[in-house]
């Protein structure tokens, strides 16, 4: 008995071939011997089966001795043994229809779980293997679960259902709703304007929701809400903003915030959350601000950084075009009695400068100038 696998919602064509290459009488029946369709001369006749409005054949092939049964918009319950009666012969074809669906929605928040459920006919024992867009394979039976979805899981998932050594492939498009970056870090000299950007990693027709930026300053004991906003059809409107600092927010996507001045008291970490309409859970992006200050007080030239720096970073003070006078894995370094000239304070990661601040040291009888 021939086995054919079909996909729910698709069309399947079951073949039936006579030895004579001409149009002769044929009938298709189901396992209950109920006639589905057949012919009477050159006319197609249909029986009283449930497939009535979804069953068809190809009259153009009859003259070649081919009498296919076409079933449109397949349903799981169409799984059955179909019998083609032609030339006193009976050809049996077992049709097994499978369906694969994603739980609730194919638009899921980063960190949520994706569950794929296989609908299969009674008596079948299929195995399923799915390949994610990033090439990760998962296997299972009736259900497959992927916890903690990541941004790279966005795209087409290809799932293969295997039954009786035959396979049928499903493609499911999954959109992981997330920010492009989970975390970002901004390095600024004291007094500079700070730009925070929060680009989304997906595009949808209409985007509605609300968001908030909570900030934990390094110097503060508790976190504070810096701004709350609404998002309506990709338009941003500020609901509430603190007076210190007074952030400004762009009116269009991507979400964009401006801090007028980088100051040591603002250095720290923020968490921007975005709650989307009709979605449970929130999108998150962490943002960090590191602020550098170079100062000269009497005979002491000091360079300091505030904010979430890594222990890998090196802080150095050097006279322009000279070797570093001091270079340590600290958040503050200093030089006593610095010689006159342009001094550079450098924050670097493995030799790569992340942040630089210059301070001019004048001969001892003058006061320092900050460029």
């Amino acid at each position: 008995k021939k086995v054919v696998l079909g996909k729910k919602g698709d069309t399947v064509e079951l073949t039936c071939t006579a030895s004579q290459k001409k149009s002769i009488q044929f009938h298709w029946k189901n396992s209950n011997q109920i006639k589905i369709l057949g012919n009477q001369g050159s006319f197609l006749t249909k029986g009283p089966s449930k497939l009535n409005d979804r069953a068809d054949s190809r009259r153009s092939l009859w003259d070649q001795g081919n009498f296919p049964l076409i079933i449109k918009n397949l349903k799981i319950e169409d799984s059955d043994t179909y019998i083609c009666e032609v030339e006193d012969q009976k050809e049996e074809v077992q049709l097994l229809v499978f369906g694969l669906t994603a739980n609730s929605d194919t638009h899921l928040l980063q960190g949520q779980s994706l569950t794929l459920t296989l609908e299969s006919p009674p008596g079948s024992s299929p195995s399923v293997q799915c390949r994610s867009p990033r090439g990760k394979n998962i296997q299972g039976g009736k259900t497959l679960s992927v916890s903690q979805l990541e941004l790279q899981d966005s795209g087409t998932w290809t799932c293969t259902v295997l039954q009786n050594q035959k396979k049928v492939e499903f493609k499911i498009d999954i959109v992981v709703l997330a920010f492009q970056k989970a975390s970002s870090i901004v390095y600024k000299k004291e007094g500079e304007q700070v730009e925070f950007s929060f680009p989304l990693a997906f595009t949808v027709e209409k985007l509605t929701g609300s968001g908030e930026l909570w900030w934990q300053a390094e110097r503060a004991s508790s976190s504070k809400s810096w701004i709350t906003f609404d998002l309506k059809n990709k338009e941003v409107s500020v609901k509430r903003v603190t007076q210190d600092p007074k952030l400004q927010m762009g009116k269009k996507l991507p979400l964009h915030l401006t801090l007028p001045q980088a100051l040591p008291q603002y250095a720290g970490s923020g968490n921007l959350t975005l709650a989307l309409e009709a979605k449970t859970g929130k999108l998150h992006q962490e943002v960090n601000l590191v602020v550098m200050r170079a100062t000269q007080l009497q005979k002491n030239l000091t360079c300091e950084v505030w904010g979430p720096t890594s222990p890998k970073l090196m802080l150095s003070l050097k006279l322009e075009n000279k070797e570093a006078k001091v270079s340590k894995r600290e958040k503050a370094v200093w030089v006593l009695n610095p010689e006159a000239g342009m001094w550079q304070c450098l924050l670097s990661d493995s030799g790569q400068v992340l942040l630089e601040s210059n301070i001019k040291v004048l001969p001892t009888w003058s006061t320092p100038v900050q460029p």
């Epitope: 340590k328 894995r329 600290e330 990661d349 030799g351």
Partner: antibody, heavy 120, light 113 residues
Framework: QVQLVQSGAEVKKPGASVKVSCKAS????????MNWVRQAPGQGLEWMGI????????SYARKFQGRVTMTRDTSTSTVYMELSSLRSEDTAVYYC?????????????WGQGTLVTVSS | DIVMTQSPDSLAVSLGERATINCKSS????????????VAWYQQKPGQPPKLLIY???TRESGVPDRFSGSGSGTDFTLTISSLQAEDVAVYYC?????????FGGGTKVEIK
Amino acid sequence: QVQLVQSGAEVKKPGASVKVSCKASGYTFTSYAMNWVRQAPGQGLEWMGIINPSGGSTSYARKFQGRVTMTRDTSTSTVYMELSSLRSEDTAVYYCAREGDYGSGEFDYWGQGTLVTVSS
Amino acid sequence: DIVMTQSPDSLAVSLGERATINCKSSQSVLSSSYNKNYVAWYQQKPGQPPKLLIYWASTRESGVPDRFSGSGSGTDFTLTISSLQAEDVAVYYCQQYYSTPLTFGGGTKVEIK
């Protein structure tokens, strides 16, 4: 697996220059800084400097400033160390060493070493 | 520059016995900002490059046997081999990476008594 493969031994005359290469494989080349460390025969280890392959920026030990140049070729995942104005005391095994994941100063993978002999 | 001074220069220990190597830095390598000691220990066998054993003064590199341990803080550091094996015969170096230039100790040669 991570591998650092260095160029072969060199014999140079005083005053000449030498260029040693170090080809990296088994990891993302631009994600880890590379250091150069030398070891004179029967002596200890001496740090020469560092290159950050992602931007090409360098930092050299004061002792070698003006004589050493570290470069990289991201297309071949190779770093180079050129030492000029060679003298007999530069005779040593030169190692490239990848910076570790943690403190950016501990070296978790080393090349096999390149012996540079300076002799008239 | 920070000077790293190792002692002893050489050490002969019986198989299965404890070996202790000391390293002293000329100034503290404990970062007050990050509360970390920027000290690493390496093992070097003849004709081979050094091999990282310990970083952050006391964290063992993956794949390093647990008979190797590091301790100390500030300016005084110790590498201990709890039960010396034949394959541990080598020269051991300490290194600071708190400040540039990065510097190494002079090395301690460990032999079997």
